[in-house]
Amino acid sequence: NRCKKAPVKSCTECVRVDKDCAYCTDEMFRDRRCNTQAELLAAGCQRESIVVMESSFQITEETQIDTTLRRSQMSPQGLRVRLRPGEERHFELEVFEPLESPVDLYILMDFSNSMSDDLDNLKKMGQNLARVLSQLTSDYTIGFGKFVDKVSVPQTDMRPEKLKEPWPNSDPPFSFKNVISLTEDVDEFRNKLQGERISGNLDAPEGGFDAILQTAVCTRDIGWRPDSTHLLVFSTESAFHYEADGANVLAGIMSRNDERCHLDTTGTYTQYRTQDYPSVPTLVRLLAKHNIIPIFAVTNYSYSYYEKLHTYFPVSSLGVLQEDSSNIVELLEEAFNRIRSNLDIRALDSPRGLRTEVTSKMFQKTRTGSFHIRRGEVGIYQVQLRALEHVDGTHVCQLPEDQKGNIHLKPSFSDGLKMDAGIICDVCTCELQKEVRSARCSFNGDFVCGQCVCSEGWSGQTCNCSTGSLSDIQPCLREGEDKPCSGRGECQCGHCVCYGEGRYEGQFCEYDNFQCPRTSGFLCNDRGRCSMGQCVCEPGWTGPSCDCPLSNATCIDSNGGICNGRGHCECGRCHCHQQSLYTDTICEINYSAIHPGLCEDLRSCVQCQAWGTGEKKGRTCEECNFKVKMVDELKRAEEVVVRCSFRDEDDDCTYSYTMEGDGAPGPNSTVLVHKKKDCPPGS
């Protein structure tokens, strides 16, 4: 029980120890105030005096999924949850991906000089592209953007004539330009594409990351539709520049990317000189936020760069582009089919104190953590939201910025669930209602949550004990102990006030009244109470565990005497003078103890005299020095010296006999033999 063990000084500290900890504010309560609710109640704290932080969970927005709609949907859409540190909550999420959904396809192409043949092929393939899209969905848009790199040294040749025309028959260099916003008009797309000319730059890595970011955040300019699948084809044959990779240090561009849209009226990116390229994590986050799925269509030469990069995107595709991009349509078709069967659900904007985990019994997870789904059916996912107790070794309640946030639980293709989630780090209200320098605390402390919090120099339940030094707890320390009152009470005014409503006793609370001797599992045999670690027995009982009756009732023999006169009664039992000779209840003679081989000794003579069988048959039985008497019934074993049974090998029947007297065979002793043998069936 962590609540009990924690060295807490206040209600708030207590309820932060563990999700199950509660605090008793009852002024009359004398046990540990910090405990589980169940144990506080059991210890006598009134329910209304118990402070417990209640977690809460409510769905704030829930529109049922409509499978007739051709769009991605998720339910619920909003919820509010408050958890105690260390607590977790499970709930279900439904996600629907229609068989066919609207598609927005934006092609972002590297326009450096080496890509001229690829541009020519794309111009020729406009019609083919439209055909593939129409096979996938009846509702699509298509758009086009181009990028080269930052127009600055060292990325670009800054000589005036090269800025005008970096290569023969080429356009001036630029960072990114949205050429064709997403449109349903394929002819317009084809026509605008025809007029495009290649550009150029100096270094091999391109500024594609600037372009991807602008494509993601400039929703209106690009024309992304809210309920469609957003595909971004990124086509290049070069590597990429990324945040702080050195190129911008040389260029003198130092400030971080602000993740905002910076396109002018012509669709051209304007902040290429003032802002750095974005980082990979930034792109992953922003593409997920805007439901954009990247398709990297790259040549063999640059494949290795993008092979690693694409794994950072939970749902993405990577394809090898032929040197002249002639296979772009096939590559797209394959990528689209692969993407459509994968769904990623991730928690965006989550504070560090909250962990979200999504699993599904319906769908398998892929290597990248996305789910392999079946479209057209409602998928059910299990969400586990957990409030951490510590973040980097610090209790979460000491980290306000890590305690709450609006977590966006978002699947790849739709808006997802907004979770207003937080960790309960409230201060106990009783601490806000303290009695300052209260009379209850002898004016030397504040009365808070049912107890006194004493001013320095004062201690005790009512702060009436003046404390100055360690010597004040010295009287409460048992020799060899380092905890005052054995850790089972409070040292007040130099003496121990033990916890537990009488459970602990003694000068140092050293006696645990739950640790007295037990009989059959009962403390003091349920015939006494525990005090100072010893049983104090009820009248009529004695012994260390009150298991000895003082009465002789259980020692009285059949003649009304005590132990047949052969012993004394102690603790309700006969203690016989010659223990081995008597049965252990009331000192009756145990003849089998006196003559352990008596049955065997009598056997052959009984057989010979009663039945004329056995090892003495044929010889006279005269040497047998006792008489045999045949009887109809034998007495019970406890009424005779000995009762014997043996099998007669001659007829396989069992015979029985008893002996009376003092157990010594002789002329005066008689052996009674049962007339009837006990024979097996059919004999």
Partner: antibody
Framework: QVNLLQSGAALVKPGASVKLSCKAS????????IFWVKQSHGKSLEWIGY????????NYNEKFKRKATLSVDKSTNTAYMELSRLTSEDSATYYC?????????????WGQGVMVTVSS | DIQMTQTPSSMPASLGERVTISCRAS??????LSWYQQNLDGTIKPLIY???NLQSGVPSRFSGSGSGTDYSLTISSLEPEDFAMYYC?????????FGGGTKLELK
């Protein structure tokens, strides 16, 4: 209007006792503790002790435990302090003041003070 | 017991002047400090409680500040009725103790 009215000045002989009174009016007598404070001539103030008019329970500054005895009469809303075995050291002005059951505000109203002179 | 040391013990000042009286505790008193004014006729009147809170009916020219062991009372502009004896008092821990007093007199 809250008022703490103290008895008149007293001239007493060494070894004798004196009982000072403090009559409260303008508030509920049992809702506030009554404290007593000593001020020797030209000196600062010293806290003697206090009494709970409701229960009669008292608490004394260790220094005055054998000197002062506090009591109340709820029927007349009056607090008393008896000083015994008087010596010249006890010559001083004695004030009564009130203090709420708890709070940030200690002594909000004071009596006018009573001068005790110990002389043979 | 907590010792309260008040400085200065006497302070000559003129009308309209701004004055500050200091009070130091022998250990931290958690802001549980009051200031009292004692007039020549012996009547005692509370001015400030809990370091900086003005007692009702006390003019706003009186103010208090401080924390830990060091506290002060400031009168922004002296009026004729302000020339009196001033005491600080801690009520963090009993016995509640007073400072030695500061006599504010007309220069």
């Amino acid at each position: 209007q809250v008022n703490l009215l103290q008895s008149g000045a007293a001239l007493v002989k060494p070894g004798a006792s004196v009982k000072l009174s403090c009559k409260a009016s303008g508030y509920t007598f049992t809702d506030y503790y009554i404290f007593w404070v000593k001020q020797s001539h030209g000196k600062s103030l010293e806290w003697i002790g206090y009494i709970n008019p409701n229960s009669g329970s008292t608490n004394y500054n260790e220094k005055f435990k054998r000197k002062a005895t506090l009591s109340v009469d709820k029927s007349t809303n009056t607090a008393y302090m008896e000083l015994s075995r008087l010596t010249s050291e006890d010559s001083a002005t004695y004030y009564c003041t009130r203090r709420a059951y708890y709070g940030y505000n200690p002594f909000d109203y004071w009596g006018q003070g009573v001068m005790v002179t110990v002389s043979s | 017991d907590i010792q309260m040391t008040q400085t200065p013990s006497s302070m000559p000042a003129s009308l309209g002047e701004r004055v500050t009286i200091s009070c130091r505790a022998s250990r931290g008193i958690n802001n549980y400090l009051s200031w009292y004014q004692q007039n020549l006729d012996g009547t005692i009147k509370p001015l400030i409680y809990y370091t900086s809170n003005l007692q009702s009916g006390v003019p706003s020219r009186f103010s208090g500040s401080g924390s830990g062991t060091d506290y002060s009372l400031t009168i922004s502009s002296l009026e004729p009725e302000d020339f009196a004896m001033y005491y600080c008092q801690q009520y963090d821990s009993s016995p509640w103790t007073f400072g030695g007093g500061t006599k504010l007199e007309l220069k």
